[in-house]
Each structure stands twice: as structure tokens, then as C-alpha cells.
């Protein structure tokens, strides 16, 4: 896509581990869990432990210009790249995305995109060509997700914007579903 990196920094996502244990599969797939009726899926916190500081899923914040052919966004956009092992923080090396699984004999967890958002961008084109308007899909948040089978070290890669398409960022909605109503409330609940 011809991205130009502008700036980046990292944030560690530390799940609130004791509060929301991972729901059993039958609950996650429960037919009543549709987004419009129940305001979205339950929070995804897959670990049950007392030591919150032991787990880490990093959100790397990248500020970049978006390009489309010869055209470039008028302003940079900020997006996330998900990285980290979702294992004990003490086992995470300095080089993000490298290292060993924290619990190789047990279930594996991975830091992957959770939600995405769409952002309007205006693209400026050279030679006096008319500007373009596009909507770009950006990763909005990351989560630790249980992998269904063991992945060995050689398969590990950071999850960047092209690596996986996350689910859309459904915000919790009030029961009376309105047309962009209660926006401030929704922003606070995100």
C-alpha cells in the first residue's frame, strides 16, 4: 500500500484478568449474543489469574500517511499494530514479537486485532489532479485470543494492518437504538 511511517509508540494492554474469565464456547456462540440486541459481544478477557501484571498484549501506535497510487493523505492517520505474546510480561523480550510461548504445553494465546474502525481521508494528488476522498480501514484495538492449535516459533509474526482483518468496532448501544443518538455516552462506553 505504500505507507510512509511517521511516528510510532507502544502501549501495553493488560487485561483485567480476574473480572471476566473467558466464557465457555457455548456462551460465546449463543444466538442471543447479537450486537444490536445486546449491545455487542461480552468483553474478551481470556485469563483467570490473580496477577494482572503477568500478561501483556502490546498495541503499537503508528502514525502514517496513506497513499493510493500517486496520491497521499493530506494528514497522517494513526493506527495500531498488535504485537506481544499474551504471556507473562517477564518472559517478553525487548524485541517485540519475538521470544518463546509463555505456556507451550497449554493453550496458546495471541495478541491480534479485535476491532477496526473506518476513517475518512482526503488524498492529495500531484500535477493538479483533483483530490480524492476515501475511507480507510484501521485497526482500533487488540486482544489476546486463544489459538485452537499449537503454533511453533517459526510461525510467529507480528499482526500488522494487513495481517488480519479484525471484527468491526461495535460500540455498546443503548437499548433504544437511535440514529447516532447518545454519541457522547457511546464514546465514553467504548
Amino acid at each position: 500500500q505504500g505507507w510512509q511511517a511517521f511516528k510510532n509508540d507502544a502501549t501495553e494492554i493488560i487485561p483485567e484478568l480476574g473480572e471476566y474469565p473467558e466464557p465457555p464456547p457455548e456462551l460465546e456462540n449463543n444466538k442471543t449474543m447479537n450486537r444490536a440486541e445486546n449491545g455487542g459481544r461480552p468483553p474478551h478477557h481470556p485469563f483467570e489469574t490473580k496477577d494482572v501484571s503477568e500478561y501483556s498484549c502490546r498495541e503499537l501506535h503508528f502514525t502514517r500517511y496513506v497513499t493510493d497510487g500517486q496520491c497521499r493523505s493530506a494528514k497522517p492517520v494513526t493506527e495500531l499494530v498488535c504485537s506481544g505474546q499474551c504471556g507473562p510480561a517477564r518472559l517478553l523480550p525487548n524485541a517485540i514479537g519475538r521470544g518463546k510461548w509463555w505456556r507451550p504445553s497449554g493453550p496458546d494465546f495471541r495478541c491480534i486485532p479485535d476491532r477496526y474502525r473506518a476513517q475518512r481521508v482526503q488524498l492529495l494528488c500531484p500535477g493538479g489532479a483533483a483530490p480524492r476522498a476515501r475511507k480507510v480501514r484501521l485497526v482500533a484495538s487488540c486482544k489476546c485470543k486463544r489459538l485452537t492449535r499449537f503454533h511453533n516459533q517459526s510461525e510467529l509474526k507480528d499482526f500488522g494492518p494487513e495481517a488480519a482483518r479484525p471484527q468491526k468496532g461495535r460500540k455498546p448501544r443503548p437499548r433504544a437504538r437511535g440514529a447516532k443518538a447518545n454519541q457522547a455516552e457511546l464514546e465514553n462506553a467504548y
Partner: antibody
């Protein structure tokens, strides 16, 4: 490739409700932004509502506000559009349509085959 | 709610050029309305020809192009073919709410 398969034709009485389903295959429903469009016989297309990924919420056309409910069952990758208090002018073909799965957000790229809803006493 | 206007009908000769337009009751149509153009043939679901003013899709024939023209969105068909006879709809984005135009019936003869 995204494919959308809608439920079969329905005949309803005025005042009743109808629930049309749209089954997604090729991708999961959470990866897509689903919209609903209807077309009365011999008339044009009319947007009813859909998911807005900018705000992360489902929004409805003012005309249908309070009468339409769009829901999704992620366990079966099926979207639903329920329209209540039906009247004869709601007789139309109802389409579901989704965006494309790619870097740029493009809506209405894939369409269901349409569901004819007839409202008649 | 905004009203989106299109020519009710247009006729073009085979091989000829025709431009369909799409106006907004709120004023000038801009790139920030992300204009879409759809083609619909009798008994079929619509299909997208153009997104975001001028962005063609893999299935869009090269003879179709989108632009802004005189404060309206425009769909230009250059070198019309008999199979282009259809109803054409534009769609404008008003901050996440969409409004279709009334459609243009294009006849190729």
C-alpha cells in the same frame, strides 16, 4: 468471495411484522458492514439502514426509525432485518448488501438475491 | 432528509457517449459525499459500478467512469453497448446515512 443468501418470499397482513434473514458465507459477519435496501415494485432503491464502521453502530434512515430493527447472529453469520407495523406500501423486494473485504472501505459491493415481502389484507 | 435527483430517462446511440448526473438538495455534491453508482437490470439485484466518486471495480467495464461535474456527481458512459441498457442509481453518503437517487432509465438505441 462474499456471498449473501436471503430468506424466501413472505406474505403478511397490514399491522404485522416481517423478519428477513441474510446468511453470509465466505467471510464472517463481524468482518462486514451489512446494510439493507428495499425496492417497491417498479420503483427505485431505498436505503433503510446499516452498520457504520466510523461510529461503530447501526444507524437507520429517518423514515424507518422506530419501525425497523437490524440484528446479527454472529454464531450463524446471519443478519436480520425486522420491519414492524407493516402497511401496503411496504410491499417491496428487500436486499441485504455488504462492503468488500479490503483495505479501503467500500459499501454495497455484494448483494443478496432479494426477498419479496407482500403486504396484503 | 436530503433528496438526491437524477434524470428520469436518457437515450444514447450504440457507440455514443452519455453522462448521467446526480444532484443533492443540500447543495453541491463533493467528494465527501462518496458518490456511488449502481447498475440494475430487470429482475436482478443492483451491482456497483463506481465507489467514492471515481473508483471503478474489477467488474466495471472501462467505458464507465465517475467524476464530479458542475456541482453534481456524474457517470459517463463512452461507447455505449446494447447491454448497457439498464436503470442506473446514484447514492450519496450524508455522514453515514445514505440516500439513493430516483434512478435513470438508460435506453440504448
Amino acid at each position: 468471495e462474499v456471498q449473501l443468501v436471503q430468506s424466501g418470499a413472505e406474505v403478511k397482513k397490514p399491522g404485522a411484522s416481517v423478519k428477513v434473514s441474510c446468511k453470509v458465507s465466505g467471510y464472517t459477519l463481524t468482518e462486514l458492514s451489512m446494510h439493507w435496501v428495499r425496492q417497491a415494485p417498479g420503483k427505485g432503491l431505498e436505503w433503510m439502514g446499516g452498520f457504520d464502521p466510523e461510529d461503530g453502530e447501526t444507524i437507520y434512515a429517518q423514515k424507518f426509525q422506530g419501525r425497523v430493527t437490524m440484528t446479527e447472529d454472529t454464531s450463524t453469520d446471519t443478519a436480520y432485518m425486522e420491519l414492524s407495523s407493516l402497511r401496503s406500501e411496504d410491499t417491496a423486494v428487500y436486499y441485504c448488501a455488504t462492503d468488500t473485504v479490503g483495505y479501503w472501505e467500500k459499501f454495497f459491493q455484494h448483494w443478496g438475491q432479494g426477498t419479496l415481502v407482500t403486504v396484503s389484507s | 432528509q436530503a433528496v438526491v435527483t437524477q434524470e428520469p430517462s436518457l437515450t444514447v446511440s450504440p457507440g455514443g457517449t452519455v453522462t448521467l448526473t446526480c444532484g443533492s438538495s443540500t447543495g453541491t455534491v463533493t467528494i465527501d459525499h462518496y458518490p456511488y453508482w449502481f447498475q440494475q437490470k430487470p429482475g436482478q439485484a443492483p451491482r456497483t459500478l463506481i465507489s467514492d466518486t471515481d473508483d471503478k471495480h474489477s467488474w466495471t467495464p472501462a467505458r464507465f467512469s465517475g467524476s464530479l461535474l458542475g456541482g453534481k456527481a456524474a457517470l459517463t458512459l463512452s461507447g455505449a453497448q446494447p447491454e448497457d441498457e439498464a436503470e442506473y442509481y446514484c447514492l450519496l453518503d450524508y455522514g453515514g446515512r445514505f440516500v439513493f437517487g430516483g434512478g435513470t432509465k438508460l435506453t440504448v438505441l
